[in-house]
């Protein structure tokens, strides 16, 4: 049915399928060193890995995409691993009047799925 | 900054970057012919194409991902083209008591971005 449960066991082997992974990045890596003051180093959770058939399908569209990719791989791409939710982060950054705090709620991934 | 505007012109040439494309699919293609009655053929809009640096970035996370992919391509994947919104679709399907209409909110893509 259109609401089949997404598959959660990876058929490709451990760590190969869509999952959350921590990537260390400095403000210089991000090109933010001129306006963000702190933290100097960010632990950025990102979504990496493959999306085999019906693995962690985000929704009905992703299930259809997986199916049609099997039928028409040149025309329809496989689903890919993207954030399903985010963790807010507070950054200290420069302002005209000094330093202020600002939250970013779309910066660090909290969970991943195949869309 | 973290809120740079997403780039909208495709540097790879016409039709190569992330966009919406219509894919024809029958109920048989989708494996739905045993429970969906109508429509027999669906025009499924799907997101296809590449996501070059900062093209149609979904959010701050996607911008970071694009940047880190440039620095660490083996560790951080490029953003990929996924739906940003959906168009509701009404399907007529079999039930125990006969036939009913049901709306699916997450079946057909309406817009795309790079996440």
């Amino acid at each position: 049915s259109a609401h089949a449960h997404p598959r959660d066991s990876c058929p490709l082997g451990p760590g190969r399928c869509c999952h959350l992974e921590t990537v260390q990045a400095t403000l210089e890596d991000l090109g933010w060193s001129d306006w963000v003051l702190s933290p100097r180093q960010l632990q950025l959770s990102m979504c990496v890995g493959e999306c085999p058939h019906l693995y962690r399908s985000a929704n009905t569209h992703a299930q259809i995409k997986a199916r049609l990719h099997g039928l028409q791989p040149d025309k329809v791409p496989a689903p890919c691993c993207v954030p399903s939710s985010y963790t807010p982060v507070v950054l200290m950054h420069r302002t005209d009047s000094g330093v202020s705090l600002q939250t970013y709620d779309d910066l660090v991934a909290r969970g991943c799925h195949c869309a | 900054s973290a809120h740079a505007h997403p780039r909208d012109s495709c540097p790879l040439g016409p039709g190569r970057c992330c966009h919406l494309e219509t894919v024809q699919a029958t109920l048989e293609d989708l494996g739905w012919s045993d429970w969906v009655l109508s429509p027999r053929q669906l025009q499924l809009s799907m997101c296809v194409g590449e996501c070059p640096h900062l093209y149609r970035s979904a959010n701050t996370h996607a911008q970071i991902k694009a940047r880190l992919h440039g620095l660490q391509p083996d560790k951080v994947p490029a953003p990929c083209c996924v739906p940003s919104s959906y168009t509701p679709v009404v399907l007529m399907h079999r039930t125990d008591s006969g036939v009913s209409l049901q709306t699916y909110d997450d079946l057909v893509a309406r817009g795309c971005h790079c996440a």
């Epitope: 702190s38 933290p39 180093q41 963790t87 807010p88 507070v90 330093v99 709620d105 | -």
Partner: antibody, heavy 119, light 110 residues
């Protein structure tokens, strides 16, 4: 084991100055922000401000701006909260707290320093 | 007056389930996570729940958090005498940064 150890209780007179401390151990002191929180007798928690010990950047709650100074000495993994001229209304328990990884919550707290200001 | 509103007190008998609410607005709870702290009598606050519904290691699973819209709640099941404490919610507010609720005193009856 992460620990924040604060200096002992203080009894002061109005108009006097004071500097209390918070020493971090069991983690990389410069990798986490330190915040200060006030709790007046019988009352709730109030956020006063935050410092990034690595660069000594400070941000204050509007309610405490100009009333206190937050500083840090990263060479001895210690953060400070100071007053140049105490008032009776500064009588309270003061806590230092370490910020969690993404800066949205306080994951470890000091035991508190009780400051009593009375003539 | 706290930016986040909590009931001043709640009570329950041992073994019961109690909930503590925390009401905010679209400029705080509505946009960011809620965290909960437990302050046992005469001690420093301790992180109980972070990011709406996550427990730090060592916190019993009798404690759980949830958030809906501009409100959050802390639930404690199988109430025990040692749960008697003050409980504070905390979030972020765009105007005053880190904000706490006024605190709720939990009394375990009997």
């Amino acid at each position: 084991e992460v620990q924040l150890v604060q200096s002992g209780a203080e009894v002061k007179k109005p108009g006097e100055s004071l500097k209390i401390s918070c020493k971090g151990s069991g983690y990389s002191f410069t990798s986490y922000w330190i915040g200060w929180v006030r709790q007046m007798p019988g009352k709730g928690l109030e956020w006063m401000g935050v410092i990034d010990p690595s660069g000594s950047y400070t941000i204050y709650s509007p309610s405490f701006q100009g009333q206190v100074t937050i500083s840090a000495d990263k060479s001895i993994s210690t953060a400070y909260l100071q007053w140049s001229s105490l008032k009776a209304s500064d009588t309270a328990m003061y806590y230092c707290a370490r910020y969690g990884r993404y800066g949205t919550y306080f994951d470890y707290w000091g035991q508190g320093t009780l400051v009593t200001v009375s003539s | 007056q706290s930016v986040l509103t909590q009931p001043p007190s709640v009570s329950g008998a041992p073994g019961q389930r109690v909930t503590i609410s925390c009401s905010g607005s679209s400029s705080n709870i509505g946009v960011l996570y809620v965290n909960w702290y437990q302050q046992l009598p005469g001690t420093a606050p301790k992180l109980l729940i972070y990011s709406n519904d996550n427990r730090p290691s060592g916190v019993p699973d009798r404690f759980s958090g949830s958030k809906s819209g501009t409100s959050a709640s802390l639930a404690i099941t199988g109430l025990q005498a040692e749960d008697e404490a003050d409980y504070y919610c905390q979030s972020w507010d765009s105007s005053s940064n880190y904000v706490f609720g006024g605190g709720t005193k939990l009394t375990v009856l009997g």
